[in-house]
């Protein structure tokens, strides 16, 4: 998977008046990394691993960047004409990626009241707008404003892209990100399904990086995809990930089934418990 940095900023308006302040979150490699603390007006690391990325360096640079981005987005929201009374939001999501072959990707997306209305591929300078008339109107509105604003020229977008990649590379210099390997905790549980059947679930949690293989095997052979149910691989809030896989088996055949896990070049197999929950830490 590519390394990525994702900025998510939101500004609000009430009865046509743009509110001061903004909401901001930054994800590094899909993990919550920074958020903007509105009380302290500072960028704050999300959890211990985020603090470890920069070590003892301050977060002034991140604070400055987020503050500038928030200000820009408030100005953009002020230029959206059709704001009706009540609460409205403008959200900007900016992502830059560095792939294994060192190629880069960068994109930007705008949402009004949660609905996507404008996207840009920064490399190709291509803008795309969804078909809905509301999106078309909003996009025209915002693009006209962006064209008027000398700051929003092509060079500005390329500079933003370059800044994003520079920050990403700076974070990746930290061995905490590049060499970070947290083995999963794997636990297998069983629950009654229907008469004569049980559902066995294999959960992997607290692992990093995100890539993992988790599958049920019968007599050592992987079950077909259509006989298994997978959960998404999701952040668990601690800078690590979690996922699960489940299948239905005949009661009395538990001994035939094992959960196979592969992560960061290591693997383990986990049997179905005979009745009670079984929790196993993978020891490599």
């Amino acid at each position: 998977e590519p390394h990525s940095l994702r900025y998510n900023l939101t500004v609000l308006s009430w009865d046509g008046s743009v509110q001061s302040g903004f909401l901001a979150e930054v994800h590094l490699d899909g993990q919550p990394f920074l958020r903007y603390d509105r009380q302290k007006c500072r960028a704050k690391p999300q959890g211990q691993w985020a603090e470890d990325v920069l070590g003892n360096k301050t977060w002034d640079r991140e604070t400055r960047d987020l503050t500038g981005n928030g200000k820009d987005l408030r100005m953009t929201l002020a230029h959206i004409k059709d704001q009706k009374e009540g609460l409205h939001s403008l959200q900007e999501i900016r992502v830059c990626e560095i792939h294994e072959d060192n190629s880069t990707r960068s994109s930007q997306h705008f949402y009004y009241d949660g609905e996507l209305f404008l996207s840009q591929n920064v490399e190709t300078e291509e803008w795309t707008v969804p078909q809905s008339s509301r999106a078309q109107t909003l996009a025209m509105n915002v693009r006209n404003f962006l064209k008027e604003d000398a700051m929003k020229t092509k060079t500005h977008y390329h500079a933003m892209h370059a800044d994003c990649l520079q920050e990403l590379r700076r974070y990746l210099e930290s061995s905490v990100v590049l060499r970070r390997r947290v083995p999963p905790m794997v636990n297998v549980t069983r629950s009654e399904a229907s008469e004569g059947n049980i559902t066995v679930t294999c959960r992997a949690s607290s692992f990093y990086p995100r890539n993992i293989t988790l599958t049920w095997r019968q007599d050592g052979v992987s079950l077909s995809h259509d006989t298994q149910q997978w959960g998404d691989v999701l952040p668990d809030g601690n800078g690590t990930y979690q996922t699960w896989v489940a299948t239905r088996i005949c009661q009395g055949e538990e001994q035939r089934f094992t959960c196979y896990m592969e992560h960061s070049g290591n693997h383990s197999t986990h049997p179905v418990p005979s009745g009670k929950v079984l929790v196993l830490q993978s020891h490599w």
């Epitope: 050592g220 992987s222 693997h267 197999t269």
Partner: antibody, heavy 118, light 107 residues
């Protein structure tokens, strides 16, 4: 490429025991089960049991429980089958096999002939 | 135990022939059936898994089919190296069981 190298032929006396080995190479040994199969002279194949080399978990054919014991040595990527209280009925070729994770008995050893004779 | 029956214990065919070997299970086995080839020197090789999936490296003249309790292996164009004994094997239920084998000989 995946290879399973079995130990040589054994001539043993009734009542004695024997240990057949199966050395795996060409893949990560603890990833895949090792299966054992018996073939008596001129007869069909019979599944004895299997072992998960990662944790040593075993599943046996009820018929061979008490007769065969499956073990592994992870450090040498070798699986073993210990046969005890041998009788002429145990004279056979014994095969080990492994899987690619998608099909059973994907790769086979060359077989080990065990002859039980006074 | 699920009994696997290969009614034909030996079969004579000529090179280039289309040969079909059958196997029936004592009960439905949900396509959980493999076919193996054992050469006269004792070498065993997996040909077909899960009824009809061709194992990597196996010539396409081998094919498998069937459902429920009845299954078959077909060799579309018999070659000299196909002279061997063929076994079916079920993995629907433990213990895993094999058929008695069908020995293929040249006419």
């Amino acid at each position: 490429q995946v290879q399973l190298q079995q130990s040589g032929p054994e001539l043993v006396k009734p009542g004695a025991s024997v240990k057949v080995s199966c050395k795996a190479s060409g893949y990560a040994f603890t990833k895949y089960n090792i299966y054992w199969v018996k073939q008596s002279h001129g007869k069909s194949l019979e599944w004895i049991g299997y072992i998960d080399p990662y944790n040593g978990g075993t599943v046996y054919n009820q018929k061979f429980k008490g007769k065969a014991t499956l073990t592994v040595d992870k450090s040498s990527s070798t699986a073993y089958m210990h046969l005890n209280s041998l009788t002429s009925e145990d004279s056979a070729v014994y095969y080990c096999a492994t899987t690619d994770g998608y099909s059973l008995f994907t790769y086979w050893g060359q077989g080990t002939l065990v002859t039980v004779s006074a | 135990d699920i009994q696997m029956t290969q009614t034909t214990s030996s079969l004579s065919a000529s090179l280039g022939d289309r040969v079909t070997i059958t196997c029936s299970a004592g009960q439905g086995i949900n396509n959980y059936l493999n076919w193996y080839q054992q050469k006269p020197d004792g070498t065993v090789k997996l040909l077909i898994f899960y009824t009809s999936s061709l194992q990597s490296g196996v010539p396409s003249r081998f094919s498998g089919s069937g459902s429920g309790a009845d299954y078959s292996l077909t060799i579309s164009n018999l070659e000299p190296e196909d002279i061997a004994t063929y076994y079916c094997q079920q993995y629907s239920k433990l213990p895993l069981t094999f058929g008695a084998g069908t020995k293929l000989e040249l006419k």
